[in-house]
């Protein structure tokens, strides 16, 4: 018997206080399948309908989350907030349910939603003004001639508060990219009641026109390319409609600010990308070697000439031919399209290199992840400790700490009878989470499992987001288990960047019951197994001070491979003393971020290394011990013969050779291991 939990609709930000009540209507989500009928907008038709409202909200330009915010920005210790107006997408013409912006659109920040169309399509925008003053919806692509021909009144370029207006136009060939250009071309839409004031107040969004048969019918976007629109501008709050109100909010009486004071003016100017300053724009997350298209926009006066640079990467522009570039000069009112194949995993910066702009915070970070870096984060191994796993409640002894994949015993999982339950994992630091493996459990003759669930996540434990991923609806509902023992691997594509992961059962059998593993990597995608277990590191690359041989067994260095099975399935030195070492030659400089160690067990004897040192060398002759906090780091190794233990290297080692020096052990020195890291990357 499958029990269903009812959920209520999701907001972009949820103030999460350990309860959830989300009501799911069928049209709110899809469960992997591409059932176009579920979508509030149907993208197969030639008319693409968008419901967009002007909505007022408070904005802090990311200052509350920036560690770099200048002291003088914050008065009396608080971060100033500014009333702004933004284009907000809704699910339908009732304008009651905002369309939740998932991971793929999170980067838009202050920008309105993407409006996408192909040549010959019709675009219909139903615009509602939910703000307190008149605004409009305007794009240079919209043709108003028909209105004139039909003898209609001249176009009113504003919509009063609480009024709705529908705009309809056909995408002409001249609006589209030429055959020599990239598949899609960027334009903008904004409000033109007073173009300058409207934009400085926040009303602008990207409008993409594409070649025919480019957009996926189910998703309404090009699924083979990941798109990011970046709007570089200096927001001047003195030019906002809400300037007076914002000044009163941020400078309480008696306020003795002088309007002409340069410091005052500078405090009301924000050198922003999509409305965020100083590396705070979220959502720029992309896969290594995946095609990325950047739409670069600038608006405003001539001071909004920007010199755009992506650290560590080149990009291409296409005008008849493709040109590789490292810098792009962006002029106001010009929307440029560039593409990139990010080849280097890690965290990089996109910035305007004009000194004043860069100094003032016109930069942000983009994260390139490697799809190869997907390892268990430690539920099964115990690397994720008991205290990191909490839940809304538990049934009897079925505690959250038991929610570990493959856990065995008569009570071997987390379980709860509560209808609105959740289980939370604190990874202690932000990680890239690529997927989740789930498993149910048995109690006597009953199969207990979660058949459907949703995922929420957070970087700080306060602001929570519901995972939407590639779903065409407002959130992704994952199919879980169908029995008590099988393992279901659900992939997060795009991956989740979070410290905290919440799993919320929506359907379950008898009780919500779970064993799980999280698959992921560190933020730099640099905790990949370098090849001990997989044998990508050859036998010849593994050497040692000595090794033990017996009549029918050789415990050679090449046996020091994590999870190796067989009779002599580890490295053992000839003698057990602290002078012995095991060495790996990577044959080129690698970035080493961790080591996983494991002991070994013969029939009755457990053998493992309890403590070890690490040294490194670039030439194989000069060796340096790994130091931390000014002293040689003694790594805590294994506590049994079978459980792998991960030790992180902080800071990471850039090295060709690595040595493990066992310092204390149980019974005998015996070692199986993996080295974690990635290729060392040249920065340019």
């Amino acid at each position: 018997e499958i029990t269903r939990t009812t959920l209520q609709s999701d907001q972009e930000e949820i103030d999460y206080d350990d309860t959830i009540s989300v009501e799911m209507k069928k049209e709110d989500f899809d469960i992997y399948d591409e059932d176009e009928n579920q979508s509030p907008r149907s993208f197969q038709k030639k008319t693409r309908h968008y419901f967009i409202a002007a909505v007022e909200r408070l904005w802090d330009y990311g200052m509350s989350s920036s560690p770099h915010v200048l002291r003088n920005r914050a008065q009396s210790g608080s971060v100033p907030q500014f009333k702004k107006v933004v284009f907000q997408e809704f699910t339908d013409g009732s304008f009651t349910q905002p369309l939740y912006r998932g991971e793929l659109n999170e980067h838009l920040g202050l920008l309105g939603p993407y409006i996408r169309a192909e040549v010959e399509d019709n675009i219909m925008v139903t615009f509602r003004n939910q703000a307190s003053r008149p605004y409009s919806f305007y794009s240079s692509l919209i043709s108003y001639e028909e209105d004139q021909r039909q003898g209609a009144e001249p176009r009113k370029n504003f919509v009063k508060p609480n009024e709705t207006k529908t705009y309809f136009w056909k995408v002409q060939h001249h609006m589209a990219p030429t055959k020599d250009e990239f598949d899609c071309k960027a334009w903008a839409y904004f409000s033109d009641v007073d173009l300058e004031k409207d934009v400085h107040s926040g009303l602008i969004g990207p409008l993409l026109v594409c070649h025919t048969n480019t957009l996926n019918p189910a998703h309404g976007r090009q699924v083979t390319v990941q798109e990011f629109a970046l709007f570089f501008t200096i927001f001047d709050e003195t030019k906002s409609w809400y300037f007076t109100e914002n000044m009163e909010r941020n400078c309480r009486a008696p306020c003795n600010i002088q309007m002409e004071d340069p410091t005052f003016k500078e405090n009301y100017r924000f050198h922003a990308i999509n409305g965020y300053i100083m590396d705070t724009l979220p959502g720029l997350v992309m896969a290594q070697d995946q095609r990325i298209r950047w739409y670069l926009l600038s608006m405003g006066s001539n001071e909004n000439i920007h010199s755009i640079h992506f650290s560590g990467h080149v990009f291409t522009v296409r005008k008849k031919e493709e040109y590789k570039m490292a810098l792009y000069n962006l002029y106001p009112g010009v929307f440029e399209t560039v593409e990139m194949l990010p080849s280097k995993a890690g965290i990089w910066r996109v910035e305007c290199l004009i000194g004043e702009h860069l100094h003032a915070g016109m930069s942000t970070l983009f994260l390139v992840y490697s799809n190869k870096c997907q390892t268990p984060l430690g539920m099964a191994s115990g690397h994720i400790r008991d205290f990191q796993i909490t839940a809304s409640g538990q049934y009897g002894q079925w505690a959250p700490k038991l929610a570990r994949l493959h856990y065995s015993g008569s009570i071997n999982a987390w379980s709860t009878k509560e209808p609105f339950s959740w289980i939370k994992v604190d990874l202690l630091a932000p990680m890239i989470i690529h997927g989740i493996k789930t498993q149910g459990a048995r109690q006597k003759f009953s199969s207990l499992y979660i058949s459907q669930f949703i995922i929420m996540y957070s970087l700080d434990g306060k602001k929570w987001q519901t995972y939407r991923g590639n779903s065409t609806g407002t959130l992704m509902v994952f199919f879980g288990n169908v029995d008590s023992s099988g393992i279901k691997h659900n992939i997060f594509n795009p991956p989740i960047i979070a410290r905290y992961i919440h799993l919320h059962p929506t359907h379950y059998s008898i009780r919500s019951t779970l064993r799980m593993e999280l698959m992921g990597c560190d933020l730099n995608s640099c905790s990949m197994p370098l090849g001990m277990e997989s044998k990508a590191i050859s036998d010849a690359q593994i050497t040692a001070s000595s090794y033990f041989t017996n009549m029918f067994a050789t415990w050679s260095p090449s046996k020091a491979r994590l999870h190796l099975q067989g009779r002599s399935n580890a490295w053992r030195p000839q003698v057990n003393n602290p002078k012995e070492w095991l060495q790996v030659d990577f044959q080129k400089t690698m970035k080493v971020t961790g080591v996983t160690t494991q002991g070994v067990k013969s029939l009755l004897t457990s053998m493992y290394v309890k403590e070890f040192l690490i040294s490194s060398s670039q030439d194989g002759h000069q060796w340096t011990l790994f130091f931390q906090n000014g002293k040689v780091k003694v790594f805590q190794g294994n506590q049994d013969s079978f459980t792998p233990v991960v030790n992180s290297l902080d800071p990471p080692l850039l090295t060709r050779y690595l040595r493990i020096h066992p310092q204390s052990w149980v019974h005998q020195i015996a070692l199986r291991m993996e080295v974690l890291g990635c290729e060392a990357q040249d920065l340019y």
């Epitope: 033990f548 041989t549 017996n550 009549m551 029918f552 067994a553 009779r567 000839q574 003698v575 057990n576 013969s602 029939l603 009755l604 004897t605 053998m607 005998q668």
Partner: antibody, heavy 117, light 108 residues
């Protein structure tokens, strides 16, 4: 738990052969080699030889070469030691033992072989 | 082939005393390959020490092993009544395995 159970005592005439068995339980025979050790009455321990059921390879002590054969039946997890051309000085208790992992950690209870005319 | 010689042949001590048993090899070898066994009448030998100094599982800490090269020692720090038995040293390894002739530890 891991156990080695040997076959019962044997009385043989000189020139005959004897086959002593050693049944392992608690693990699979191919996991470890089987060593055989003899102990004549009132005397010390003497290594006879070793057999690796995984590879079928055997190593015999010089004194026993030509008169001992070690085999195994991996389907039943039984190791065998056959002594041929028995002489009266072959009278001894024969032990099977397995290394865990190196020295002889696990021993059978011993099989008394008496060679007497 | 390496020969092992144990001394003394017989050691007579009282409970509570310290026993030191010696094992000398005809040529040097790695201490990794030296073991000590205890054998009581009518029983199979029992492993005490391997790798010259590592106690086997379940062996009381009054038993300790030391030595390298050609000279190895088994020490019983404080004799208990159940420790009176015959003790053998053994050289194991990659080829031939040899035992010493044994030291009988008897109650004085």
């Amino acid at each position: 738990q891991v156990q080695l159970v040997q076959s019962g005592a044997e009385v043989k005439k000189p020139g005959a052969s004897v086959k002593v068995s050693c049944k392992v339980s608690g693990y699979t025979l191919t996991e470890l080699p089987v060593h055989w050790v003899g102990q004549a009455p009132g005397k010390g321990l003497e290594w006879v030889g070793s057999f690796d059921p995984e590879s079928g390879e055997s190593i015999y002590a010089r004194e026993f070469q030509g008169s001992v054969t070690m085999t195994a039946d991996t389907s039943t997890d039984i190791a065998y030691m056959e002594l041929s051309s028995l002489r009266s000085d072959d009278t001894a208790v024969y032990y099977c033992a397995v290394p865990d992992p190196d020295a002889f950690d696990i021993w059978g209870q011993g099989t008394m072989v008496t060679v007497s005319s | 082939e390496i020969a092992l010689t144990q001394s003394p042949g017989t050691l007579s001590l009282s409970p509570g005393e310290r026993a030191t048993l010696s094992c000398r090899a005809s040529q040097s070898f790695s201490s990794s390959y030296l073991a000590w066994y205890q054998q009581k009448p009518g029983q199979a030998p029992r492993l005490l020490i391997y790798g010259a100094s590592t106690r086997a599982t379940g062996i009381p800490d009054r038993f300790s092993g030391s030595g390298s090269g050609t000279d190895f020692t088994l020490t019983i720090s404080r004799l208990e009544p159940e420790d009176f038995a015959v003790y053998y040293c053994q050289k194991y390894g990659t080829s031939a395995i040899t035992f010493g002739q044994g030291t009988r530890l008897e109650i004085k």
